[in-house]
Structure formats: C-alpha cells, structure tokens
Interface confidence: low
Amino acid sequence: VPPGEDSKDVAAPHRQPLTSSERIDKQIRYILDGISALRKETCNKSNMCESSKEALAENNLNLPKMAEKDGCFQSGFNEETCLVKIITGLLEFEVYLEYLQNRFESSEEQARAVQMSTKVLIQFLQKKAKNLDAITTPDPTTNASLLTKLQAQNQWLQDMTTHLILRSFKEFLQSSLRALRQM
C-alpha cells in the first residue's frame, strides 16, 4: 500500500502524525523501492543492466534530469527553484510512467503502484510549493503522441526505453530526496 494511503498509520493513534517533509521523504523511498523491483525484472529478462552507463548516457528520450541551474545541488542550492524543478520533472515523468504500464509481467502491480504513488507525491509537493505559477504542465497532445511512438517501437527498442526510464527516474528521485532533505 502506498504511503499516504497506509491503513496502519490510521490504526496507530499513539504514533506522532508524519510531518509534510516526513511524508514526502517516505513517499519517495516507497517509489524507489518499487523502481528497484521493476529494475530487477527488467535485468533478469536481458543483459541490458550490465551495459555501461556511458553506452546509455546519450539518448533522445528527453527524460527529466537535474542540472546545476535547477538549484537542487549543494552548490548553488535554491529552495524555490529546486522545488519547481522537482514538481515539473515529476509531471514530465508521468507520460513515461504510463508507458511502463503493461511492460511488466510479474511486476504489473508494482508498475501501477509506482505510477499512482508518484501522483500522490506530486500532490504533496504542490501543497508545499508557493510559486505554482512557475510550474509548467506538459502538453497532453504532445504526451499522447510521444506515448504512441514509444509503444510502436519493436521489442528491443521498448526494452531499451523501459531500462532508461527506470534508471533516469531512480536518479531523479534520489537527487530530489537529497535536495528535499535540505529544505
């Protein structure tokens, strides 16, 4: 059960309620656990996880990535800029998470859980963000077109795409987690 929808929290009145930051932290760690499970299935199916990071570093998926200018790194940290980047990035990842659905056999529920938990995380972060005007939402038509093209690829291109999405999403969440802990 995704955190934030955790029935055990409700049934434990003696426990201190989680603060906003704690909930976000817990939510990200839950999603990262889900990604690990999905990566395990992907890696078991082919040798793609053994390939060097350099071999896959350059790709045209335009997956969200943290850069110095985003203000999420310790050097040049900027809370507001960084939070906008995290939310914008997560919104951009949503189309790729949609693509991941039906890409897994034994981990189908896990893929759905990662997608739904990310939606919950976005909601948590949007409550935390003051400058919502700076957050641009991806164009639904562009997303629909991208999804169609990714789904039309042959099997090994889809394997590549799946691997890249999982790896990039994991890295983005790890960077986000480190940054949010400074806020």
Epitope: S46, N47, M48, E50, S51, A55, L56, E58, N59, N60, L61, T148, K149, L150, Q151, A152, Q153, N154, Q155, W156, L157, D159, M160, T161
Partner: antibody
C-alpha cells in the same frame, strides 16, 4: 569514432547467393541497444532497407526481401554479414551497412559504410 | 509494406527556405529520420527522431512531424545543401525500416 567497411565480391552470377561482410571498428556490435542494418541503392535509384541484426542477435527483414535475405554476425571478429539468395540483375546495387545507435529512439542510422557496388551479371 | 511519399524534386533559391515533405506509412506512430546524400557518397543523417539534429549538422536544418506528415526544413539554403534527401521511418510493426523515394534538391543562384 565508429567505422564500418563493407567487403565482398563485386560481381555475382544470376541465381547465385550474394555474400557481403561489414567490419566494425571503434564500437562493439554487441553494445546494448545498437543495431546493424544493410541498405542498398540500385544505380540512379533510391535507398532500400534490407534488414537488421540487433545487439542481442535478433534479426528483422524487409517484408519484400524476407524470403531471400539472411543476416548473421561474428562477434569475435566484430562483423555482421548479409546473404541474398537467388540474385537477378535487379539486385545490382551499391550495398551499405549502417548502425542505429542507442541514442536514437527510432530506426535512424547515424554511421554508414562507404558502400560497395555489387553487379549481378553472367 | 506501405512506402513513404516524397516529392521527386524541389528547387530553392540560394538563401531561401526549402521544405521537403514526407507522408504515408506509419509516420503518425513512428519517428521520421532524414538523410542527405551527395553523388558517390553514403547518406548522412541530418535529422533523427522527428526533430533532433545530430552534432555537426548546421542549425539551418530542422525537422517536424504532425498527423502522419514529416517535414525537413532548410532555412537559408546554401549551395552545399544541393543533393538527394531521403526520409525514413519504421513500418507499422516497428520491426522494419522503410525509406521514402528521395527528393533531389537544387539550389539556384
């Protein structure tokens, strides 16, 4: 820098099998998500894609040539090869080998050999 | 296997904009790629995945794709841009590549 070099006989008799090899340097033909294609171009005409062998050894062929085409590889020599059976003069063309890199999502080909002319004639 | 349709020839005045179109096949659901070929040479990738430009390709080359039609645009065509241009995509299965018939671009003036 990846380099591809096509090699094979420049003249093949009708009804025989055309065999070409592409030797790759500067990159491995088993590198994840790369794929290696054969394309041909008859004199004065356009490009025709023939088939591909992916990094994992899986092959795909042009539907119009599928019955006559076979692509294989020798990973120890970093080479991949094309066999086209039952050739006719219409198979006379410049034959290119090319790479589809992992950084292209679609089937675009970023590195090409210079091409080798194969003439089918008795 | 449905092919891709391109105009066979196109002329553009030096410094003007040339637009080469490509349609058919499964362009609505597959990426378009564009190649430039000069006489006696191998094709060179100038645009990949609809609208991305490889390093080393001049900025005047751009690509777009919408509703089953892909377009290669050369803004401010130069004499060295003269040659044949081919669009390429995947077929509906995603397993086979397919090329357009090619467009011969002539740069006048």
């Amino acid at each position: 820098e990846v380099q591809l070099v096509e090699s094979g006989p420049g003249l093949v008799k009708p009804s025989q099998t055309l065999s070409l090899t592409c030797t790759v340097s500067g990159g491995s033909i088993t590198a994840s998500f790369d794929a290696w294609s054969w394309i041909r171009q008859p004199p004065g005409k356009g490009l025709e894609w023939m088939g591909v062998i992916a990094y994992d050894g899986s092959t795909y062929y042009s539907p119009s040539l599928k019955s006559r085409t076979s692509i294989s590889r020798d990973t120890s020599k970093n080479q991949f090869s094309l066999q086209l059976s039952s050739v006719t003069p219409e198979d006379t063309a410049v034959y290119y080998c090319a790479r589809k890199s992992s950084w292209l999502i679609g089937y675009g080909m970023d590195y090409w050999g210079k091409g080798t002319l194969v003439t089918v004639s008795s | 296997q449905a092919g891709l349709t391109q105009p066979s020839a196109l002329s553009v005045t030096l410094g003007q904009t040339a637009k080469i179109t490509c349609q058919g096949g499964s362009l609505g659901s597959s990426y378009a790629h564009w190649y430039q070929q000069k006489p006696g040479q191998a094709p060179v990738l100038v645009i990949y995945d609809d609208d991305s430009r490889p390093s080393g390709i001049p900025e005047r080359f751009s690509g777009s794709s919408s509703g089953g039609r892909a377009t290669l645009t050369i803004s401010g065509a130069q004499a060295e841009d003269e040659g044949d241009y081919y669009c390429q995509s995947a077929d509906s299965s995603g397993n086979a590549a397919v090329f357009g018939g090619g467009t011969h671009l002539t740069v006048l003036g």
